[in-house]
């Protein structure tokens, strides 16, 4: 009975999410393998988040709006491990917008989800950020490593969206 009611609940939750995401990829987790964590297909998952690499070239504002429509934000990178996971799926000759910007040009960088900007957990390329005119951050491959660079916000780039996993 307990298992049956849990399955019914899951099915109704899945139906609820189906109107937003036509397909979900779910894995069982938790100590009793009773919880399912899901990401929209074909998003990738890492820890408690789902990631989507958009190859559509758009400005920073349009990229953030695009993520928002999908229930996500431009990516907020919190750890080196997270960045290493993300960069596995990126092309080394491309640049991708992050959810990091400095809208007033005061070098007060801010994440789209209001996560505090911690200077100790940043991965700027050497010498970056280097221009108050360049108010949006990308991640790109330079000098044999992935790192961040400040760029003009209106220049179209690819982007990375991030959302919390869906638990059912």
């Amino acid at each position: 009975n307990f298992m049956y009611s849990k399955t019914v609940k899951r099915l109704s939750k899945l139906q609820e999410y189906q109107q937003y995401y036509p397909s979900l990829t779910c894995v069982m987790e938790g100590k009793d393998m009773e919880d399912w964590s899901c990401c929209p297909t074909p998003w990738t998952s890492f820890q408690s988040s789902c990631y989507f690499i958009s190859t559509v070239m758009q400005s920073w504002t349009k990229s953030q709006n695009n993520c928002s429509v999908m229930g996500a934000d431009l990516v907020v990178i919190n750890t080196k491990e997270e960045q290493d996971f993300i960069t596995q799926n990126l092309k080394i000759n491309s640049a991708y917008f992050l959810g990091l910007s400095d809208p007033k040009g005061w070098r007060h960088w801010q994440w789209v989800d209001q996560t505090p900007y911690n200077k100790n957990v940043t991965f700027w390329h050497s010498g970056e950020p280097n221009s108050p005119d360049e108010r949006c951050a990308i991640i790109n491959f330079r000098s044999e490593e992935w790192g961040w660079n400040d760029v003009h916000c209106h220049v179209p780039q690819k982007s990375i969206c991030k959302m919390k996993k869906i638990y059912i």
Partner: antibody, heavy 121, light 111 residues
Framework: EVQLLESGGGLVQPGGSLRLSCAAS????????MSWVRQAPGKGLEWVAT????????YYPDSVKGRFTISRDNSKNTLYLQMNSLRAEDTAVYYC??????????????WGQGTTVTVSS | DIVLTQSPDSLAVSLGERATINCKAS??????????VNWYQQKPGQPPKLLIY???NLESGIPDRFSGSGSGTDFTLTISSLQAEDVAVYYC?????????FGGGTKVEIK
């Protein structure tokens, strides 16, 4: 007073090359992103190129990409536009302008008087 | 590319009367409460001059008879009381996304 003085325009044959210069004074040139905008005779305005203050990032519309190169020499307070493989439709007055950011966008706040480029055989 | 369509193409207004110019974008140029549309004035034989930025902010040194309004895709430049020195072509421009694009221009003349 901000002054932007373009030079280098002239008559050139299709397929030819030309280098425009823009000498800036009255601003700390090395801190400014700069742009070129053109205006064909009797027509509207068209953005041509932008370069950031350090000169390491450049941007172009598809209409000139691969043919035009924007560059700068901050020690000389000068902006350049190298134009190759010129076409009749590149005939225009070319203006240099300073770029001022506005949140996630920008404005072109100071403009030079322009230099005329004519591409004709 | 974002297309900006200005209307009318030309406008004849009596001295002291109001002039209104419209600019329609092919997609929204707003983000987080700001609109990325600017207005420029170009007099014959002169370079363009910035009047309004961010849809409604008056550039320093521009007379306050000029004003801008609008958001999303629809924007307006208003000259509240036309003066002889306002005879010019007016252009809207978007800076939300490259390539920056300009409207086709509106020629303002005195009736």
């Amino acid at each position: 007073e901000v002054q932007l003085l373009e030079s280098g325009g002239g008559l050139v044959q299709p397929g030819g090359s030309l280098r425009l210069s823009c000498a800036a004074s009255g601003i700390t040139f090395s801190t400014y992103t700069m742009s070129w905008v053109r205006q064909a005779p009797g027509k509207g305005l068209e953005w041509v190129a932008t370069i950031n203050s350090g000169g390491d990032n450049t941007y172009y519309p598809d209409s000139v990409k691969g043919r035009f190169t924007i560059s700068r020499d901050n020690s000389k307070n000068t902006l350049y536009l190298q134009m190759n493989s010129l076409r009749a439709e590149d005939t225009a007055v070319y203006y240099c302008a300073t770029y001022r950011p506005y949140y996630y966008g920008s404005v072109l706040d100071y403009w030079g008087q322009g230099t005329t480029v004519t591409v004709s055989s | 590319d974002i297309v900006l369509t200005q209307s009318p193409d030309s406008l004849a207004v009596s001295l002291g009367e109001r002039a209104t110019i419209n600019c329609k974008a092919s997609q929204s140029v707003d983000y987080d409460g700001n609109s990325y549309v600017n207005w420029y004035q170009q007099k014959p034989g002169q370079p363009p001059k910035l009047l309004i930025y961010g849809a409604s902010n008056l550039e320093s040194g521009i007379p306050d008879r000029f004003s801008g309004s609008g958001s999303g895709t629809d924007f307006t430049l208003t000259i509240s009381s036309l003066q002889a020195e306002d005879v010019a072509v007016y252009y809207c421009q978007q800076s939300d996304e490259d390539p920056w694009t300009f409207g086709g221009g509106t020629k303002v003349e005195i009736k």
